[in-house]
Structures are given as structure tokens and as C-alpha cells.
């Protein structure tokens, strides 16, 4: 299953990055799980994950650094609290969970650049 | 199963990166699991993961650094808490979980760049 996501995203000065994860036509998929993975070298770590259905909105856990909305086969993801050290490749993994058959696809990743703002000068 | 994701994403100064993960036609997949992996050299670490259905929204765990939304075969992922040291290749892995048969696909990865901002100059 094909998963598309932007190649590069520049996080805002507030440390928030948003991007769209789009997957191949879901057909009759009723439950879809989206996972954002961060790849550092050969290591992949899960940043966040959420499941949504055709009737319910995308819902991340309360303490998740991610938020988002879904529309058809597109998921608008927003990651907050980003720091320059978080710059890296973020991979969107989409799983069509139910009903059978199960399909899974991973995007090529979105390079997210986070630039820490320079400290403001002190005022005398 | 083909998974598409952007090649590069620049994270915001807040350490948040968003991108779209798109996977091949899911047919009647009802449950999809998306995992974002971070590749560092030969090592892959899971950044985040979430399962969603056609009826329930994408949902990452509460403590996940990711948020996102889904739309058909596209997932908009947002990763929060990114740091410059997190810069790397993030692979989107999509698994069509249910109903059978099981399908899995991984994107080529999205290079996410996180840039730490320079310190602000002092004022005299």
C-alpha cells in the first residue's frame, strides 16, 4: 500500500511541524492506524500513533506531542514541542486494520528541520 | 505494498515536523497500523505508532511525540519534541492489519531536518 508524505518540512519557530500523510485509496477500510516513526540512522523510534475510523476523528492520546485531523485518505499531522535536536526523518506508517484484508504501508519519511531560535538579547 | 512519503522535511523551531505518509490502495482494509521508524546508520528505532480504522480516528498514545490525521490512504503526521540530534531518516511503515490478508509496506524514508536556532544577541 502506497503512503505519501512530503519530503521536507520546516518546523515553526514555536517547534510545531505539520504535514500531510496520504495513503492509497482505503476502499472499505473501517479502521485505520497512523504511526509516526522517527528514523535516526538504522534506528526507528515511534513518535506517536493514532487510530481513526470512518465515523470518528483522529485521536491521539492526551499527552501525545502530535495532533491531527483526517479527511478521506489524507491525514493532517501536527507535531508540537519540536527542538532542533528533533530534526530528522519522520516516517508515516499507515495500517488498514479492519475489515480484512490487513494492509500496511510506510512513507519514505518527511525530513523535518527544527531550528532553535537564537536567544533574545538581554535588555539593560 | 507501496508506501510514499516526502524525501525531506524541515522541522519547526519548536521541534515539530509534519508530513504525509501515503500508501497504496487499501481496498477494504478496515484497520491500519502506521509506524514511524527512525533510521540511524544500520539501526532502526520506532518513533511512534498508531492504529486507525475507517470509523475511528488515528490515535497515538498519550505519551507519544506524534499526532496526526488520516484521510483515505494518506496520513498527515506531526512529530513533536524534535531536536537537532533527532535529524535523520524517518521511515513510514504501513501495515494493513484487518481483515486478512496482512500487508506491510515501508516508505523510503523522509529526511527530517531539525535546526537549533542561534542564540539571540545581547543588547547593550
Amino acid at each position: 500500500m502506497h503512503v505519501a508524505q512530503p519530503a521536507v518540512v520546516l518546523a515553526s519557530s514555536r517547534g510545531v511541524a505539520s504535514f500531510v500523510c496520504e495513503y492509497g485509496s482505503s476502499g472499505n477500510a473501517a479502521e485505520v492506524r497512523v504511526t509516526v516513526l522517527r528514523q535516526a540512522g538504522s534506528q526507528m523510534t515511534e513518535v506517536c500513533a493514532a487510530t481513526y475510523t470512518v465515523e470518528d476523528e483522529l485521536a491521539f492520546l492526551d499527552d501525545s506531542t502530535c495532533t491531527g485531523t483526517s479527511s478521506g485518505n489524507k491525514v493532517n499531522l501536527t507535531i508540537q514541542g519540536l527542538r532542533a535536536m528533533d530534526t530528522g526523518l519522520y516516517i508515516c506508517k499507515v495500517e488498514l486494520m479492519y475489515p480484512p484484508p490487513y494492509y500496511v504501508g510506510m512513507g519514505n519519511g518527511t525530513q523535518i528541520y527544527v531550528i532553535d531560535p537564537e536567544p533574545c538579547p538581554d535588555s539593560d | 505494498m507501496h508506501v510514499a512519503q516526502p524525501a525531506v522535511v524541515l522541522a519547526s523551531s519548536r521541534g515539530v515536523a509534519s508530513f504525509v505518509c501515503e500508501y497504496g490502495s487499501s481496498g477494504n482494509a478496515a484497520e491500519v497500523r502506521v509506524t514511524v521508524l527512525r533510521q540511524a546508520g544500520s539501526q532502526m528505532t520506532e518513533v511512534c505508532a498508531a492504529t486507525y480504522t475507517v470509523e475511528d480516528e488515528l490515535a497515538f498514545l498519550d505519551d507519544s511525540t506524534c499526532t496526526g490525521t488520516s484521510s483515505g490512504n494518506k496520513v498527515n503526521l506531526t512529530i513533536q519534541g524534535l531536536r537537532a540530534m533527532d535529524t535523520g531518516l524517518y521511515i513510514c511503515k504501513v501495515e494493513l492489519m484487518y481483515p486478512p490478508p496482512y500487508y506491510v509496506g515501508m516508505g523510503n524514508g523522509t529526511q527530517i531536518y531539525v535546526i537549533d536556532p542561534e542564540p539571540c544577541p545581547d543588547s547593550d
Epitope: G27, V54 | R33
Partner: antibody, heavy 116, light 112 residues
Framework: QIQLVQSGPELKKPGETVKISCKAS????????VSWVKQAPGKGLRWMGW????????TYVDDFKGRFAFSLETSASTAFLQINNLKNEDTAIYFC?????????WGQGTTLTVSS | DVLMTQTPLSLPVSLGDHASISCKSS???????????LEWYLQKPGQSPKLLIY???KRFSGVPDRFSGSGSGTDFTLKISRVEAEDLGVYYC?????????FGGGTKLEIK
């Protein structure tokens, strides 16, 4: 509102063919699969299989392979159940049902009577 | 195939009583993703079945809170806290975890 409306009752002879329709409204037809369920007189419910309304691919339970065929007319948001070479044991009420993660909406049922 | 066994076959009750219906599967119906697609339907005479509960314990929209579902693995239960006249009919459990999906044989809830 969401509705599944089935065609009317049918009286057929053994060996004949019947085609039952199930017209959906109130939602995007190709988003949900359509299942077919058989209920013989005085009996319980039996899932016959389903058809992927996006791809058109049908899945049949073993007992309903051969003489049974699911099909679609997507432009009319309609699913069909065709039964060939009818037998007396095909006498039953046939339901169509929308399925996402459950059979949340059902047709009213079509009564098929097969008698010589 | 997964066999779904319901008990009792018939359940005579008085209005206002509590009612409990059991459904046992011949094997675990936990799907590979960890979810259990166990549902309960009510069919009244001359009508099509209506969804009450899905994913073991989630009430469908519009279903009164006197209906509740519970269970895990292979043992599941539907409870009605206070039976009303409109609750009479045949209750079916259903598993959608393993193809072919299967219904239980049904439990008839009737007045004593």
C-alpha cells in the same frame, strides 16, 4: 439519513434465477463493504459473505460458493445478490447490511420463496 | 470456522427484570491487532436485526444504557439491566474477527 432499501418479495420455481437488490443512501457507498445474510424460516442468521464496494471484489462463505454471486452498480449505489439454479432450501429472507467495524445498518430484508 | 454458542436458547423474564445472555466462541476471537470484533444484535419479529453492541462493550448510537456488553477471549455476556417491552425479541452474538464471520444461534427473550 442512512438507509439500505431492498427489492420486494420473490416467488420462484426450482431451477430459476433471482436477483435481489440493495440500494444504499445517506452515505458514500464505496466507503463501506456490503454483506449478505440469510435467514431460513424459523432459523437464525447466517453470514453469506460480502463485497468490497470499492474494488468490487466479492468474498463468499464456502456454503455459498457456486450458485451465488454478489455484484454492484456503483453509480446507483446498489449491491446485488444473484442466486442461480434455485433450490427449495434457498427459501429464506435475505438481508443486506453495511459493515465498517459492525453491521450498523441493515436492509429490511427480501423474502424469497422457492416452490414448484 | 468459529462456532458461537449462545445460552440460554430461551430466556423468560418479567418486565423490569435483569437479563443476561452468554456467548462463547470455540476459539479466541481476538484479532491480530488486539481488537475483539464481538457484536450483539436484536431482531424483533418481522424486522431486520439491529446493532446493539460492537467491539464487545461499545454501545451503538441510540442504544439505551440499560444494555451493556462485557467479556474477553472466548466468553462474552450481554446484560439488560431493566427489561422493557421493546427489548423482547431474539438476540444474536456475532464475531467478525475470523473469516468466515459467524453468528450465534440466538437467544429468545420473552415474557414469562
Amino acid at each position: 439519513q442512512i438507509q439500505l432499501v431492498q427489492s420486494g418479495p420473490e416467488l420462484k420455481k426450482p431451477g430459476e434465477t433471482v436477483k435481489i437488490s440493495c440500494k444504499a443512501s445517506g452515505y458514500t457507498f464505496t466507503t463501506y463493504g456490503v454483506s449478505w445474510v440469510k435467514q431460513a424460516p424459523g432459523k437464525g442468521l447466517r453470514w453469506m459473505g460480502w463485497i468490497n464496494t470499492y474494488s468490487g471484489m466479492p468474498t463468499y462463505v464456502d456454503d455459498f460458493k457456486g450458485r451465488f454471486a454478489f455484484s454492484l452498480e456503483t453509480s446507483a449505489s446498489t449491491a446485488f445478490l444473484q442466486i442461480n439454479n434455485l433450490k427449495n432450501e434457498d427459501t429464506a429472507i435475505y438481508f443486506c447490511a453495511r459493515r465498517g467495524i459492525s453491521f450498523d445498518y441493515w436492509g429490511q430484508g427480501t423474502t424469497l420463496t422457492v416452490s414448484s | 470456522d468459529v462456532l458461537m454458542t449462545q445460552t440460554p436458547l430461551s430466556l423468560p423474564v418479567s418486565l423490569g427484570d435483569h437479563a443476561s445472555i452468554s456467548c462463547k466462541s470455540s476459539q479466541s476471537i481476538v484479532y491480530i491487532n488486539g481488537n475483539t470484533y464481538l457484536e450483539w444484535y436484536l431482531q424483533k419479529p418481522g424486522q431486520s436485526p439491529k446493532l446493539l453492541i460492537y467491539k464487545v462493550s461499545k454501545r451503538f448510537s441510540g442504544v439505551p444504557d440499560r444494555f451493556s456488553g462485557s467479556g474477553s477471549g472466548t466468553d462474552f455476556t450481554l446484560k439488560i439491566s431493566r427489561v422493557e417491552a421493546e427489548d423482547l425479541g431474539v438476540y444474536y452474538c456475532f464475531q467478525g474477527s475470523h473469516v468466515p464471520w459467524t453468528f450465534g444461534g440466538g437467544t429468545k427473550l420473552e415474557i414469562k
